[in-house]
Structure formats: structure tokens, C-alpha cells
């Protein structure tokens, strides 16, 4: 058993049918010695008396808020949560496996630049009695500071019969140098509590590996005289690290017809312009990627050919 | 000033071209190592990230873009001293900091070159003959060093009398390649920045 926060404790259980569970001793936080009784949640049934209460915690019915009283007055509370270990592996019931970029990905994180700021998000089908707490650091043995905000509900989607809820959090490394070469990964730890179930999820990454630039901005077309060709131009996104001559991007320019079946013409360039043939009803899209370290491509910025 | 880089004139700034070749070569070599050594811990998540140049050179600090010198987090240690007779920017006035930066890059390349050559000698003794260093990568390191053209004491190739542990050698190869790739990215960024300056 360990303390998650004041008066909230996590009991770790080897979870299988007929498991013996864990013996837990609760102590009433009071100078009083006599006349103390214990109850669980809203029930008035007295579970025991005395300054300590010994319980065998086996299943969720044994978890909850234990309260010690004296003469009708509440003395203190202890909330017991359960953390299930199933055949050596901690349960992952609360969050959905996003399966991207690989199986068992519960937390996904992205950064728009090298400033040390990043966003993580996760999915769940649970709508109520759910709380998250996020901590982060650079490295784990001698951790350096990363400050995270509160996790917030950022999107709701309907997936088949189920509603899916997306939560996200923003974090900022306390003293980040955009040009630094990372040797210790960022660690992100999310504590999730649903009713009386506790779970924790972790992700470990280098900022360089989670970079995804914003799409190029100010995408414009300039027709070339007496030609079907157009000059496409764009600019670096505002959120990208500066100076741009140091943090350079490379670009992919795509001409896509109305129908998805039509052949796509693609051009790769390090410049912020390109000359392409504009077909009727086609659209031109441009996306960006770090020129020197191949992390994710940005989303497409698009303009119609007409 | 901060315009994206057009394809450079190699005569104007030959190092940019060489640094791009270097990044391509080390990335290819790392990919080959990951595939060939699939049963070894060779992915970024599995290896320890070690920097053989730590406390010996300070490329990131010495090559910091002027725009980032205002960022206190980037100014851990900027007092380094290297030889200042680089010829990469033969056609321009070379500031002290720029020479310091380029000589730091040269020292990095020299250190990695020695490590890779020593390692290749061990890998050539492996009866499995599973993986060797790409000669193209070694040649590209050499070309960039020549383009930087710094005079510096030659570091003797390390020789080891004991029987090599091939498993450890292959894991060390992965660690070295990951670290060298990261340094090659920094070198490419620096060359691009200097080319645009």
C-alpha cells in the first residue's frame, strides 16, 4: 500500500479468482484513543472499533472511503483505491490502446517545434467518475523539471456504439535549449482514477522524435504566362523554431485531382516555392518536415487550382 | 537572413554539401545496423544514449546561432578553445566563434573516425561476419574533415590485445551510430545556418 496523495492510498493486488488479497491496517488520524468506530462509504454498518482497523482487501467491494468516528463526529478519512496486477502486468482498463505508432500506445505526444513544449493526449470510453493527474521530467534517475498543466477533455467522438473521449495536457520543459542534443528522454506519467480503480500510464520520448510541424502558411498560387504551370509559394509556420536557416524544413508539394483514384504528382523541395502543372479541378497541397531529422510530416495545407 | 536554404554553390560553401552527404551516410548505416542487428538492443528506445565527445568538444555551444545566444538554457558552457585556421569559409571573413565552431566539428569527426575504425577492425574478426561499417560513411567523414582543413594532432587508432566481445561491440556500434547521427544533424543545421549567414 502507498499514499497517492493526502488520505488517498493505493492497494496493489495480484488479481486472480480466489486471490488472498492484501492485509491493510488503517490508523485513525486523531489523538483520541477510545470510543472510535469505523464505517465504509455511506454505510452506517460499523466495521470495527479502536484506533486501528485491520481489513483484508480482495476486491472492489473492500475499497472505498473508510471513516473513523467518535460520538457521531467524523475524525478522519482514508480512501482506498485498487491497482490490479494481472499475471505480472498492471491493468490498463481505463485508457484505450491507440495502436499508433505501435500496439500498447496509450499516451501519444507531439511537439510543434524544439522549444521544449509538447502536448500529450489519450482516449477513454469512460465519461464519469474519472480523474487524471500528469507529471513529467527529463530523465528518471536525476530528473530535470518539466511543468505540465491540468489534463482537460479536448474532444468527444462517436465510434460505433461507443462515445470516445479525448483528454490532453500541455507540458513545458523548464529550461530547454532548442539546439540541444537530447541524451535523456522526457518521461510522462499519467495517474488515472476511475471510481475506485487506480492505473498509471507512462511514455518516454525525445522531443526530436515527436516533432510534427504545423502546416506551411500563406500558401499561394501564381499562374505563369502562356503556360499551364503555376508557381506555388508558402512560408514556414509561425510556430516553427527559429532561425529557419538553422532549423530548416523540407517540403512535399502534391497535385491531387478531384477523384482519389487519380495519380498524385509529388515534388520534394527545400525551397519555399515550386513550379507545378495545375490540372482543372485539382488542388495543390504542401506539407513540411524537419529537413535533417525525419520525424512526422505536418498536416497538408491546400489550395484549389482554380 | 532567415530564408530557407536554396541549393548551395558547392564552391562557395563546400562543407554544406559534405555535411549533407554525412547525414545521409550515417542515417543509412544506422538503418542497416537496426535491420541486421534486429535481435540486439539497437533501437533508440533500447540503447543508452552516450556522447563520446562529452567534455572533450562543445559543438552545440560553440556553433549556437546568434539568435539563440539570448536563451540562457543554451549557454551552459561557451568557453572552449580550439585551433582557428579553418578553410571552409575561405572566401569570407571567419569570425573567432565561427572558427571555434568549425574546429569543434572537426574534433568530433576525428573522434568518431577513430572509434569507427577501431570498431570495424573488431567487427572484421567476427566469425559471424554479421555487420561492418559502410566504407562510404568513413569516406564521407574523411571528406568533410578535409574540407574543414584543420591541422590537428593525429589520434592513434586504439588497439586492444584482449579478445573482442562481439555482442558488446555490436551494441556499442548501435550506441555510436545513434549518437553520431544526432551530431550529424547538428552539423548539418550549423552548415545550413553558416551558408545562409
Amino acid at each position: 500500500i502507498w499514499e497517492l496523495k493526502k488520505d488517498v492510498y493505493v492497494v496493489e493486488l495480484d488479481w486472480y479468482p480466489d486471490a488472498p488479497g492484501e492485509m491493510v491496517v488503517l490508523t485513525c488520524d486523531t489523538p483520541e484513543e477510545d470510543g472510535i468506530t469505523w464505517t465504509l462509504d455511506q454505510s452506517s454498518e460499523v466495521l470495527g472499533s479502536g484506533k486501528t482497523l485491520t481489513i483484508q482487501v480482495k476486491e472492489f467491494g473492500d475499497a472505498g472511503q473508510y471513516t473513523c468516528h467518535k460520538g457521531g463526529e467524523v475524525l478522519s478519512h482514508s480512501l482506498l483505491l485498487l491497482h490490479k496486477k494481472e499475471d505480472g502486468i498492471w491493468s490498463t482498463d481505463i485508457l484505450k490502446d491507440q495502436k499508433e505508432p505501435k500496439n500498447k500506445t496509450f499516451l501519444r505526444c507531439e511537439a510543434k517545434n524544439y522549444s521544449g513544449r509538447f502536448t500529450c493526449w489519450w482516449l477513454t470510453t469512460i465519461s464519469t467518475d474519472l480523474t487524471f493527474s500528469v507529471k513529467s521530467s527529463r530523465g528518471s534517475s536525476d530528473p530535470q523539471g518539466v511543468t505540465c498543466g491540468a489534463a482537460t477533455l479536448s474532444a468527444e467522438r462517436v465510434r460505433g456504439d461507443n462515445k470516445e473521449y479525448e483528454y490532453s495536457v500541455e507540458c513545458q520543459e523548464d529550461s530547454a535549449c532548442p539546439a540541444a542534443e537530447e541524451s535523456l528522454p522526457i518521461e510522462v506519467m499519467v495517474d488515472a482514477v476511475h471510481k475506485l480503480k487506480y492505473e498509471n500510464y507512462t511514455s518516454s520520448f525525445f522531443i526530436r522524435d515527436i516533432i510534427k510541424p504545423d502546416p506551411p502558411k500563406n500558401l499561394q498560387l501564381k499562374p505563369l504566362k502562356n503556360s499551364r504551370q503555376v508557381e506555388v509559394s508558402w512560408e514556414y509556420p509561425d510556430t516553427w523554431s527559429t532561425p529557419h536557416s538553422y532549423f530548416s524544413l523540407t517540403f512535399c508539394v502534391q497535385v491531387q485531382g478531384k477523384s482519389k483514384r487519380e495519380k498524385k504528382d509529388r515534388v520534394f523541395t527545400d525551397k519555399t516555392s515550386a513550379t507545378v502543372i495545375c490540372r482543372k479541378n485539382a488542388s495543390i497541397s504542401v506539407r513540411a518536415q524537419d529537413r535533417y531529422y525525419s520525424s512526422s510530416w505536418s498536416e497538408w495545407a491546400s489550395v484549389p487550382c482554380s | 537572413r532567415n530564408l530557407p536554404v536554396a541549393t548551395p554553390d558547392p564552391g562557395m560553401f563546400p562543407c554544406l554539401h559534405h555535411s549533407q552527404n554525412l547525414l545521409r551516410a550515417v542515417s543509412n548505416m544506422l538503418q542497416k545496423a537496426r535491420q541486421t542487428l534486429e535481435f540486439y538492443p539497437c533501437t533508440s528506445e533500447e540503447i543508452d544514449h552516450e556522447d563520446i565527445t562529452k567534455d572533450k568538444t562543445s559543438t552545440v555551444e560553440a556553433c549556437l546561432p546568434l539568435e539563440l545566444t539570448k536563451n540562457e538554457s543554451c549557454l551552459n558552457s561557451r568557453e572552449t578553445s580550439f585551433i582557428t585556421n579553418g578553410s571552409c569559409l575561405a572566401s569570407r571573413k571567419t569570425s573567432f566563434m565561427m572558427a571555434l565552431c568549425l574546429s569543434s566539428i572537426y574534433e568530433d569527426l576525428k573522434m568518431y573516425q577513430v572509434e569507427f575504425k577501431t570498431m570495424n577492425a573488431k567487427l572484421l574478426m567476427d566469425p559471424k561476419r554479421q555487420i561492418f561499417l559502410d566504407q562510404n560513411m568513413l569516406a564521407v567523414i574523411d571528406e568533410l574533415m578535409q574540407a574543414l582543413n584543420f591541422n590537428s594532432e593525429t589520434v592513434p587508432q586504439k588497439s586492444s590485445l584482449e579478445e573482442p566481445d562481439f555482442y558488446k561491440t555490436k551494441i556499442k556500434l548501435c550506441i555510436l551510430l545513434h549518437a553520431f547521427r544526432i551530431r550529424a544533424v547538428t552539423i548539418d543545421r550549423v552548415m545550413s545556418y553558416l551558408n545562409a549567414s
Partner: antibody, heavy 115, light 112 residues
Framework: QVQLVESGGGVVQPGRSLRLSCAAS????????MHWVRQAPGKCLEWVAF????????YYADSVKGRFTISRDNSKNTLYLQMNSLRAEDTAVYYC????????WGQGTMVTVSS | QSVLTQPPSVSGAPGQRVTISCSGS????????VKWYQQLPGTAPKLLIY???QRPSGVPDRFSGSKSGTSASLAITGLQAEDEADYYC????????????FGCGTKVTVLG
Amino acid sequence: QVQLVESGGGVVQPGRSLRLSCAASGFTFSSYGMHWVRQAPGKCLEWVAFIRYDGSNKYYADSVKGRFTISRDNSKNTLYLQMNSLRAEDTAVYYCKTHGSHDNWGQGTMVTVSS
Amino acid sequence: QSVLTQPPSVSGAPGQRVTISCSGSRSNIGSNTVKWYQQLPGTAPKLLIYYNDQRPSGVPDRFSGSKSGTSASLAITGLQAEDEADYYCQSYDRYTHPALLFGCGTKVTVLG
């Protein structure tokens, strides 16, 4: 004590369907994940499928994906395996099993797919 | 073709010590715990070892398990006639959990 009893096995022609059941007793069935595991005559044990305690997630072996469906009825303390488009290579003893470090197995039910 | 590799058979005289190996990779045994089962002909598998080296109550201390890196092993000391059975190792893969990975079994023969 924990008890698992499989039923529903038998002889069936290729391409046909069969539904296996596993009746659970002696524990809070609705709190635990459950597996189906099979063993062809004289062959190795092969995992078939898993279902979470609340039925929210289901996982299948590639060899049965799209043909077999695992389900549970927690009000009846019963686990099911719906097997469609059966093939000769599905011939095996099918066991249900609890998920956990100390697991419990049923006695098995024989499924024979033969024309 | 099982992901976990076991020898097809091992044998020993009564009273002897035999060991069965089970080899996997970094993503399965290297990252997860190992179980061992005993299966007598015509019966369901019986759990012998869980969490690499733990014995459930009722399993004789002649059976012991261990794990090192990407391999595990089961040792039977003081071999007895009733130990003649098939023995299976089981683990998970970190990317496909909760799918069970089994070895293809080792037939233990008690000589004499």
C-alpha cells in the same frame, strides 16, 4: 472453489458453425478476464481468444480472426466462443481459462471438424 | 511454429535432475514473466510455476523455475515416475498482450 465447465463440442462439417460455452462458478466471474485455449491432437497448446472482465475488449489469434467471436454474459457467469466457417485445422480440445498469475482451467471440450 | 522455443524431449532416471529450457526474445520473455505448466495425458494443463520462479501451494519443491534475460528454465530434481508428462512454458509479448504465447512443449520421460 473455482470451477470452469466447457460444453458444446462435437463433430461438425467444414464450413459449419458451433458455439462453445464455459460455465463459471466459485468466484466473481464479472471481475476477471477469460481466455480460450485449444490443443489439436498430439500438438502444442494454442491461444485462441481473450475477453476483458466487462466484455469491452476482445483479442484473437490470427488463425481465427474474423471467424470466431468470444463473448460473455456476466449475469449468467458464462463465457462463449462462437465458431463460424470451421476448418479441419480447428479440430482440437478447447479449454476456457481464467486470466491471472494463478489460473484455473476447465476440463476441455472436443471439437472435430470433418466431412 | 511457436515463438517460445523448447526442446522436444528430455529424459532422466528416477532421482536425477532434469532441466527444460524456454527461449524467447526481448519483447516476450525479456519483458514479461514466465509460467510453467505440467500436462498429463488426457487432462488440462496444471500450473507449476508463475512469476518466473514462484510455486503455487501444493506444487512440490522439487520443481523450480528461473529466468535470465530472454530465456527461462524449469528444473525438476529427484525425478519421479509421476513426473512423466508434457511441460509447457508460457509468456506474453509486450506488443500483443494479453495474447498467450506458449512453447510447443517438452516431453519428460522417466527412464527405467
